[in-house]
Structure formats: structure tokens, C-alpha cells
């Protein structure tokens, strides 16, 4: 058998092969050795016992999207059926005092890889060690530590695999300099030792995206917008666009990015070499924004035409460093993945490539309450002998929209900690003048904020306001 | 005896550079991812990337906007962590930790200030 | 990327006592998860990985639980030299692997 057919249910076509190469992979023409690592098929009976007390799951994710040129990262997690936990040793053991299917256990091994009679089997040079062995049959890596991996990943996509030893934890990483830009698939095999063979113990796969565009999100805040999530904002008050570019590896680290941008008002285009950028509408209704962002990536010369001279490359920016490289990540506190592969190295030569990103949105803009200010506080008198309340009344004027509801709250001098919290429906006149009166529970300094709102916007004041004690001849103080 | 070495306290003025290290001794320093973490005064701990010593691959966080390249040296062990572009939210104390996914053995922090 | 949520905040504790510190993650981890001690000035130290396995050399006054979501590290008999800082950190999927905010254990 060969790893094709162990492994691959989505067949690869070989001219595709060609190109899309791993470096440090191997072609998944490979012969399995079926001996050491016996092959069933799906819904064989023996999947079913190749866990003690339950299946494990493998979890496969990866930070895809991936531009063409940067690297992708793959991890895989595996999660043990219930009571049932790694060691320190790597050894899978039952958690004491935990009850599942079989009652509370105790804490005894479900599986004790690295203690007794298997000790031999782990020397270097003798023949009790020719089944520490890849399904490729190369030899396990033999860095410190190393006899604590129990369980071997098979990685497979692209008509390629890649084998690493770990723990309930192992990570690759791939550089996507030569692929080709489309979804493509990542399958997970894991297999555990199973005396002096392994078993199969979870498959899993998932669907990664390679991108010849740079994968662009936006984010939009507002000052007063109530909700951030609707894409409704207010009129007269500026938005924030923050541009996030999902570059885990850096790959655009050191590539000048510049931003190109059309609000759908009529105001042109803005560019920028910015990431954030305020833009403020000044009518209401609704608006098509576009941005695209530009830059240029590290990528193959084009061949130079007999007919035509080579085009003049782009200066060279200077490469990342350390040069893009292929990780082979690590299972939980293993190494890194021993003697792992190289990524694809840059070629020497300097010519670049453009690369665009787009991201489109329809925002509402809407009026709403722009701004709210304190014009007056005042003492409220009372009767003698005096209450141990104090009455305040505050005068609370606003910009904009009409506000529809008015909440106080009372808290203490850092404004952390809210000790009342009063919110009404509000009638304001044509002037948005409003007033508001509070009680004060005794003497000492208090923070107050004032929020008005509507259906689209909140806007809030504080004040810091000083209650005096009773001496008739302590002013009222308030400080903005 | 598994030890991260990191280089001394930083000063360094707004819009500066600076370059931090981790020598890594007492374990085969390829073997191991080395992590960065900073945790400003009184905050809790930020993760900023990591870097895999045999080759050289980096994995970044890109929730956080500092702008670090990590790179290491096999021949001595050392880790380097350079910033570019700091600011005065860039204050705080960085430090070098080992393995993926979490962390083992860290180093004893470099404090870094950015000031005008 | 994953949220953790850590409470409380702060705790006051005599020696000798027990104390829980839970840790919330915005979404499902299952048991990838790692508890950290940080004492004033010095560095993290690794105390549970995989939610309730003890690093080497960690008293099992220390344990962790917990799965998916919800999480908690349990200090039986506060020692003196158990008070400083606790961290949650998630170690699930590709990075970055996100820390809580902090739990400051003080003596009482």
C-alpha cells in the first residue's frame, strides 16, 4: 500500500503535484508499512476498542487564510474520553475521583507508555528498536525527552505527508510560497503505540483557504454610535477605521502596505499608507464603502521574452528576517519537531509582486445625539431641620438628535464603582434642554454621568460634584 | 540546569528601536520553541509571538500592536526579540519563555521603558 | 481569537485555608489549559498544564479542573510562600494562546 491509499480520500492529480511542492514532505506515493501501522477502513469494528473507555477526538485548526508566500500553521489537539488526562510523563492516566461510564475511578494508567517491560524497547542500535518507526519506516527523531511522545501524526495534503512524534499536541506549519491559491484540504491520522505496533486512534481533516488576495477585515467605531455591530452610524461625528490584514506569520512584516479608500459620498478617494483612518459623513442615508489595499510581495521574476527586454524589477525591500520558513511546531512541552523540515527558501532573485486586498461595506448613516454638557448644577433648598438627603438639580443641554431616554448614575470619586443608577424617558423642547434632579445620600465627593439616548446613539458627561456637609456656610463645588 | 539569560533594563525614547535577548543554556536549544510575552506594570501577560530555533519560522500575535520581528542565533543559543517604532504603551517588562504551547521555563524579564 | 475571563480579581486568604480561582473561556478549549504563579518582581512559573496535570515539582496542595469552558484552580492549605499572582492561559488551536487577567492572592 502507499500513503495515497492509507490516507487520501481526496485523490491528487500529478501535474498539480509538480507544483504545488512542501519542502521537507514527502510524495504521498510512499509505501505504508501496514505492519507496523495496520490500515482500517472506515467503520472497521476495531476503531471502536482502539481507545480504552471511549473514543479520542482529534481537533484540527489552522490560521488560514493564508496569502500565497506566507506560512500557514496547522495544530491538532487531541481530547481523551471523560476521566482520562495526560501525565507528566505522557502516560494517560485516569483522574482520580472522577466518575464516567465505568463509575469513579481511581487514578491508575489507561495507558502507561514509558514504565516497565518497554524500557528495552527504547535503546538506540539494537533490533528490539527496528518498530520506533515512521510509517514511511524512518526512524523516530531522538531528541531529550522524546520517549515521553505518545502518539505519531501523520499530516497529510497536496499529494504529500509529513510525520511528527507528540504529545496530545502537535503543530506544523507550511510555507505557501509555490501553492496554488484555492480551498484545500489538511487530514490528521493518530496513531498510538500498540506493543510493537500502532494503531490508529482518530482521523480528522479540514479545509484550508490559500489566497492570492490579502485577506482584509475592518473594523468601524464611533463616539455616541449605540451599536457597534449594525453598520448604522451617526451623522457630523467622525468614524474610526481600523484595517486588520490576518498576517499570523509577519509574512507582510516589512512590505509598504497603502490603503485606498471610497466612502460612497462623493468625497473621491483617500489614500493613505495608515491602517486607521477617520471619515466623517455629513448627510444621512446610505453609503457603499470600498476599500482596497495594495502592496508588493517578495515573488517569482517573470521569464524574460525573447522579443521584449525584462521589465525593471521593483527595488528589493530588504527579506524578513529570519527568512520565511516552514515550521514543524511542537506537540506540549516537546521540542519543536527534531531535524524538521526547511521552508522554501527565497529565491535569490528580486523581483516583487503586487497584491490586493478588497473590503466592501453599506453603512446607514442616521442622525444622533452628538454631544451632552452639564449647564447648571444647582443646591435644591430644603426645609429645616435638614434631611439627611441632599437635592441637586442639574441642567443637562445636547446637540443632534432628540434624546429619548436620560440616565443617571451616582458612584464614587473614580468612577468605578456605581452606588445608584436612575434611568426615565425624557420629553425635551426644541432646545434639548433638560432637567434633572438627584438625591445625594450625605456629604462627600461623587461622580456623576449623564447618558442620553436614542435608538442609534448614547451619548455621556460626568461631573465630579462635592455635597457639603450641613454647616449652611459650605459651598456646593463641582468639578468637570 | 535549564536557564534563559535575558539581556538588561532598556531606555529608550518614542520612535526608537531597541533589541532584546534570551541565551538559552542547560537543554538543545533547537529542540524548543522560544516564546515572547510582555506584561506591562501591573497588567497581566500578553503573548507576542514565537520562534521555532531550528529553522527559523515565527508565529506573531496580531492582536497587539507592537512591532516585533523575533530572530535567533543557533550558533549561541540566543533568541533576539527587536522593536521598532515604540511608543510609551510599549513600556513594560518583555520576557523569553520556553516551548509551545505553554511555557516552562521563562527568563527573568527585561524591563523596557520609552520615554521622551 | 479566544477571550479567558479570570475572578476574582483580587483575594485575601490566611495560611492554611483553601482557596478556588476559576478561569472562563469565551469558547469551547476542553482541557487546553495552564495555570502560572507569578510572586512580586519574579517571573511566571508553570504550575498545571492540560487543565489538571501538575508541572514537576508542584505541591499537590495545587490542583486544576475543569473542561470546556469553566475552569478553577484549587489551593488546599495556603502555605506562605503560595501568595503572588495566578494566570489561566489557553493552550488551544493555532496561536495566539490568550492569558486571563490575573487573580492577586494576598495575605489576610
Known amino acids: 500500500k502507499r500513503f495515497r491509499d492509507v490516507l487520501g480520500h481526496e485523490q491528487y492529480p500529478d501535474h498539480m503535484r509538480e507544483h504545488n511542492q512542501l519542502r521537507g514532505w514527502s510524495s504521498d506515493e510512499n509505501e505504508w508499512d501496514e505492519h507496523l501501522y495496520p490500515v482500517w477502513r472506515r467503520g472497521d469494528g476495531r476503531w471502536k476498542d482502539s481507545w480504552e473507555g471511549g473514543r479520542v477526538q482529534a481537533v484540527l485548526t489552522s490560521d488560514s487564510p493564508a496569502l500565497v508566500g506566507s506560512n500557514i500553521t496547522f495544530v491538532v489537539n487531541l481530547v481523551f474520553p471523560r476521566c482520562q488526562k495526560e501525565d507528566a510523563n505522557g502516560n494517560i492516566v485516569y483522574e482520580k475521583n472522577c466518575r464516567n461510564d465505568l463509575g469513579l475511578t481511581s487514578d491508575l494508567h489507561v495507558y502507561n507508555w514509558t514504565a516497565g517491560a518497554d524500557d528495552g524497547d527504547w535503546e538506540d542500535g539494537t533490533s528490539r528498536s527496528q518498530h520506533l518507526r515512521f510509517p514511511d519506516r524512518r526512524p523516530f527523531p531522538r531528541p531529550h525527552g522524546w520517549k515521553k511522545w505518545s502518539f505519531v501524526y501523520v499530516f497529510h495534503t497536496l499529494g504529500q505527508y509529513f510525520q511528527k512524534l507528540g504529545r496530545c499536541s502537535a503543530r506544523v506549519s507550511i510555507n505557501t510560497v509555490n501553492l496554488t491559491a484555492g480551498p484545500q484540504v489538511m487530514e490528521v491520522t493518530v496513531f498510538r503505540r500498540y506493543g510493537r505496533a500502532y494503531i490508529p486512534i482518530s482521523k480528522v481533516k479540514d479545509v484550508y483557504v490559500i489566497t492570492d488576495q490579502i485577506p482584509v477585515f475592518v473594523t468601524m467605531s464611533q463616539k455616541n454610535d449605540r451599536n457597534l455591530s449594525d453598520e448604522i452610524f451617526l451623522r457630523d461625528l467622525p468614524i474610526v477605521f481600523d484595517v486588520l490584514i490576518h498576517d499570523p506569520s509577519h509574512f507582510l512584516n516589512d512590505s509598504a502596505i497603502s490603503y485606498k479608500w471610497n466612502f460612497g459620498d462623493n468625497t473621491g478617494l483617500f489614500v493613505s499608507n495608515n491602517h486607521t483612518l477617520n471619515h466623517t459623513y455629513v448627510l444621512n442615508g446610505t453609503f457603499n464603502l470600498n476599500l482596497t489595499v495594495q502592496t508588493a510581495v517578495p515573488g517569482p521574476c517573470p521569464p524574460p521574452s525573447p522579443s521584449t527586454p525584462p521589465p525593471p524589477s521593483t527595488p528589493p525591500s530588504p527579506p524578513p528576517s529570519p527568512l520565511p520558513t516552514l515550521s514543524t511546531p511542537s506537540p506540549s512541552l516537546m521540542p519543536t519537531g527534531y531535524k524538521s523540515m526547511e521552508l522554501s527558501d527565497i529565491s535569490n532573485e528580486n523581483c516583487r509582486i503586487n497584491r490586493y486586498g478588497y473590503f466592501r461595506a453599506t453603512i446607514t448613516i442616521v442622525e444622533g445625539i452628538l454631544e451632552v454638557s452639564i449647564m447648571q448644577i444647582a443646591d435644591v433648598p430644603m426645609p429645616t431641620p435638614q434631611p439627611a438627603n441632599s437635592l441637586m438639580d442639574f441642567t443637562v443641554t445636547c446637540k443632534g438628535a432628540t434624546p429619548m431616554e436620560a440616565c443617571t448614575i451616582i458612584s464614587d470619586p473614580t468612577c468605578q464603582i456605581a452606588q445608584n443608577r436612575v434611568c426615565s424617558p425624557v420629553a425635551v423642547d426644541g432646545l434639548c434642554l433638560l432637567s434633572v434632579r438627584r438625591a445625594f445620600n450625605g456629604s462627600g465627593t461623587y461622580c456623576v454621568n449623564f447618558t442620553l439616548g436614542d435608538d442609534a446613539s448614547l451619548a455621556l458627561t460626568s461631573t465630579l460634584i462635592s455635597i457639603p456637609g450641613k454647616d449652611p456656610d459650605s459651598p456646593l463645588r463641582a468639578v468637570n | 540546569e535549564v536557564q534563559l539569560q535575558q539581556s538588561g533594563p532598556e531606555l529608550v525614547k518614542p520612535g526608537a528601536s531597541v533589541k532584546i535577548s534570551c541565551k538559552a543554556s542547560?537543554?538543545?536549544?533547537?529542540?524548543?520553541?522560544m516564546n515572547w510575552v510582555r506584561q506591562s506594570h501591573g497588567k497581566s501577560l500578553e503573548w507576542i509571538g514565537d520562534?521555532?530555533?531550528?529553522?527559523?519560522?515565527?508565529t506573531y500575535n496580531q492582536k497587539i500592536k507592537v512591532k516585533a520581528t523575533l530572530t535567533v542565533d543557533k550558533s549561541s543559543s540566543t533568541a533576539y526579540m527587536e522593536l521598532r517604532s515604540l511608543t510609551s504603551e510599549d513600556s513594560a517588562v518583555y520576557y523569553c519563555?520556553?516551548?509551545?504551547?505553554?511555557?516552562?521555563?521563562w527568563g527573568q524579564g527585561t524591563t523596557l521603558t520609552v520615554s521622551s | 481569537d479566544i477571550q479567558m475571563t479570570q475572578s476574582p480579581a483580587s483575594l485575601s486568604a490566611s495560611v492554611g485555608e483553601t482557596v478556588t480561582i476559576t478561569c472562563r473561556a469565551s469558547?469551547?478549549?476542553?482541557?487546553?489549559l495552564v495555570w502560572y504563579q507569578q510572586k512580586q518582581g519574579k517571573s511566571p512559573q508553570l504550575l498545571v498544564y492540560?487543565?489538571?496535570t501538575l508541572a514537576e515539582g508542584v505541591p499537590s496542595r495545587f490542583s486544576g479542573s475543569g473542561s470546556g469552558t469553566q475552569f478553577s484552580l484549587k489551593i488546599s492549605s495556603l502555605q506562605p510562600e503560595d501568595f503572588g499572582s495566578y494566570y489561566c492561559?489557553?493552550?488551544?488551536?493555532?496561536?495566539?494562546?490568550?492569558f486571563g487577567g490575573g487573580t492577586k492572592l494576598e495575605i489576610k
Open positions: 520562534i521555532n530555533p531550528y529553522h527559523g519560522g515565527s
Open positions: 492540560n487543565a489538571k
Open positions: 492561559q489557553h493552550h488551544f488551536g493555532t496561536p495566539p494562546y490568550t
Open positions: 469558547e469551547n478549549i476542553y482541557s487546553f
Open positions: 519563555a520556553r516551548n509551545w504551547p505553554y511555557f516552562d521555563y
Open positions: 542547560g537543554y538543545t536549544f533547537t529542540d524548543y520553541y
